[in-house]
């Protein structure tokens, strides 16, 4: 069964800067990745970035740099201040559209016990199936 993992890290040097890493553990070919915050995309969440392997990348503030790390994982750097700044309990979600598995989404946030600069382990988060 495919899985999606989400890792959230707050940068020690910039407390309003977050790095989100997401990956897809499956055998299919990824056709689109959507990163959102505040909940799943389409369920109250706000899109931060969309990554298409053959057309490119689109991002919205406070996203600063979205990029593919591997064929099946991405990273997103967020920078914010004031109202657009993420906070420690913000939920980030990644949705992977893949053939033939369909769409798989997982969400994660910074663990309450995390010190700045420490990261949550990249374990698969609860998975939402969204066909």
């Amino acid at each position: 069964t495919p899985e999606v993992w989400v890792q959230v890290r707050m940068e020690a040097t910039e407390l309003s800067s977050f790095t989100i890493r997401c990956g897809f553990l499956g055998s299919g070919s990824i056709s689109l990745v959507t990163v959102s915050w505040g909940g799943p995309n389409g369920a109250g969440g706000t899109t931060l970035a969309v990554l298409h392997p053959e057309r490119g990348i689109r991002q919205w503030a406070p996203a600063r740099q979205a990029r593919w790390e591997t064929q099946s994982s991405i990273s997103l750097i967020l920078e914010g201040s004031g109202a657009s700044s993420p906070c420690a309990n913000t939920t980030f979600c990644c949705k992977f559209a893949s053939f033939p598995e369909g769409s798989w989404e997982a969400c994660g946030s910074l663990p309450p016990s995390s010190d700045p600069g420490l990261s949550a382990p990249p374990t698969p988060a609860p998975i939402l199936r969204a066909d």
Partner: nanobody, 118 residues
Framework: QVQLVESGGGLVQAGGSLRLSCAAS????????MGWYRQAPGKDRELVAT???????KIVDSVKDRFTISRGDAKNTVSLQMSSLKPEDTAVYFC????????????WGQGTQVTVSS
């Protein structure tokens, strides 16, 4: 399918300047990396310079002091400013785009001829 259209090639004397431009048909997504390669007669195609959508630049040492690359204000445009041109810069210059930065799908322009006469 992303289309790349180049312009700005031509004939120039040694020591002169040229500016090459390339525009992509993709207007919704940012292409992660765009760049320029060149192919001289009888030689392999070689990298000249690349730039990511966030502004990270790579320029080969042989042209680093003479060429600059930039992304335009319009989405997915890239320019190569070439100065102090030398006869050995004569080549067909190709615009290149890699939307993901992973090489999964790479697009090429048709090429524009640059000829530097001595």
């Amino acid at each position: 399918q992303v289309q790349l259209v180049e312009s700005g090639g031509g004939l120039v004397q040694a020591g002169g300047s040229l500016r090459l431009s390339c525009a992509a048909s993709e207007t919704y997504f940012d292409l992660y990396v765009m760049g320029w390669y060149r192919q001289a007669p009888g030689k392999d195609r070689e990298l000249v310079a690349t730039i990511t959508y966030t502004g990270s630049i790579k320029i080969v040492d042989s042209v680093k002091d003479r060429f600059t690359i930039s992304r335009g204000d319009a989405k997915n445009t890239v320019s190569l400013q070439m100065s102090s041109l030398k006869p050995e810069d004569t080549a067909v210059y190709f615009c290149n785009a890699d939307p993901s930065g992973l090489g999964r799908k790479v697009y090429w322009g048709q090429g524009t001829q640059v000829t530097v006469s001595s």
